[in-house]
């Protein structure tokens, strides 16, 4: 028969023949032959391979270095790498999460639109009219101005995006 030019899924072509790939969690020891199957070997502790493969070496599990603000979110297995995330108050600098940076704070005049997570930074938004923020914070949203009317008071000083309104007593009309 004609030697194959392409192989099925989970196979690879070598020496004009289709060999089975090694399953996740195992590495290649020797290619198949006309008479023998592909020989695979499990990855050891601290190693993994996460795909059907013909790799001759397993990959080392990633180290979540605490000196870079990292911690383990999920321990690796023979089929999965370690998943790192960041310590409280920090977030990853990239999708691979190789290091962490401190969550950004929203300056006065800005509030938190979305609180940071281990993988995303704080999202700030300017306080719209009627709202303010007088602190630099990674958690505080813009607060609404105090409603003087509901307290039977009047506005003595207008609010800004950084300050609340100042309420005062109503001027009594003299008879």
């Amino acid at each position: 028969p004609e030697p194959p030019t392409a192989c099925r899924e989970k196979q690879y072509l070598i020496n004009s023949q289709c060999c089975s790939l090694c399953q996740p969690g195992q590495k290649l020891v020797s290619d198949c032959t006309e008479f023998t199957e592909t020989e695979c070997l499990p990855c050891g502790e601290s190693e993994f391979l996460d795909t059907w493969n013909r790799e001759t070496h397993c990959h080392q599990h990633k180290y979540c270095d605490p000196n870079l603000g990292l911690r383990v979110q999920q321990k690796g297995t023979s089929e999965t790498d370690t998943i790192c995330t960041c310590e409280e108050g920090w977030h990853c600098t990239s999708e691979a999460c190789e290091s962490c940076v401190l969550h950004r704070s929203c300056s006065p005049g800005f509030g938190v639109k979305q609180i940071a997570t281990g993988v995303s930074d704080t999202i700030c938004e300017p306080c719209p009219v009627g709202f303010f923020s007088n602190v630099s914070s990674a958690f505080e949203k813009c607060h609404p101005w105090t409603s003087c009317e509901t307290k039977d008071l009047v506005v003595q000083q207008a609010g800004t995006n950084k300050t609340d309104v100042v309420c005062g007593p109503q001027d009594r009309l003299r008879a």
Partner: antibody, heavy 118, light 106 residues
Framework: EVQLVQSGAEVKKPGATVKISCTVS????????IHWVKQRPGKGLEWMGR????????KYDPKFQGKATMTADTSTDTAYMELSSLRSEDTAVYYC???????????WGQGTTVTVSS | QIVLTQSPTIMSASPGEKVIITCSAT?????ILWFQQKPGTSPKLWIY???NLASGVPARFSGSGSGASYSLTISRMEAEDAATYYC?????????FGGGTKLEIK
């Protein structure tokens, strides 16, 4: 600083039980497997077993199944190994050690000497 | 279970001499770890994943091998290398150590 600190030396009578501890600092115990290794006086290293502190999963060398019981308390970052029905051949130094990551290369405790003597 | 046999069991080498310690397994393993132990101290991971030196290990050390046959080599023996060396496999449970090689300085 990363450390594995083991409990102190023990002298026990044959038939007794001993529980030794291994407290880690500088990292989270759940991030590693904890292995226990036995070394009799003047002899080589013997792997006894390991525990995954995260879920308590254990693997033992059949030789130590029934002799050793490994547990872990993640709230105190401490692993324990209890040895039962002690005999003179259990006289040894027992080490706790971690799985390794590239960057840590595995950590070892200072060893706990257990002496079994009548 | 996988049995690891180290050879030689004991040896002495002169300063500057090349040293080779072998570790053979009863069947293939993914990798070998090598540990160094000096009297009265805990073992230290010396070589990981067959051929990678742990932090602080001098470059005169190297590791090689695959399948069931592995070795640790010291290109030029130094006095501080006198110790007992153990190989370990962490591929199949139960994990096992070799019997150790005691290396002395002449």
């Amino acid at each position: 600083e990363v450390q594995l600190v083991q409990s102190g030396a023990e002298v026990k009578k044959p038939g007794a039980t001993v529980k030794i501890s291994c407290t880690v600092s500088g990292f989270n115990i759940k991030d590693y497997y904890i292995h226990w290794v036995k070394q009799r006086p003047g002899k080589g290293l013997e792997w006894m077993g390991r525990i995954d502190p995260e879920d308590g999963d254990t693997k033992y060398d059949p030789k130590f199944q029934g002799k050793a019981t490994m547990t872990a308390d993640t709230s105190t970052d401490t692993a324990y190994m209890e040895l039962s029905s002690l005999r003179s051949e259990d006289t040894a130094v027992y080490y706790c050690t971690t799985s390794y990551y590239v960057g840590t290369y595995g950590y070892w405790g200072q060893g706990t000497t257990v002496t079994v003597s009548s | 279970q996988i049995v690891l046999t180290q050879s030689p069991t004991i040896m002495s080498a002169s300063p500057g001499e090349k040293v080779i310690i072998t570790c053979s397994a009863t069947s293939s393993v993914s990798y070998i770890l090598w540990f160094q132990q000096k009297p009265g101290t805990s073992p230290k991971l010396w070589i990981y994943s067959t051929s990678n030196l742990a932090s602080g290990v001098p470059a005169r050390f190297s590791g090689s091998g695959s399948g069931a046959s592995y070795s640790l080599t010291i290109s030029r023996m130094e006095a501080e290398d006198a110790a007992t060396y153990y190989c370990q496999q962490r591929t199949f449970y139960p994990y096992t150590f070799g019997g150790g090689t005691k290396l002395e300085i002449k």
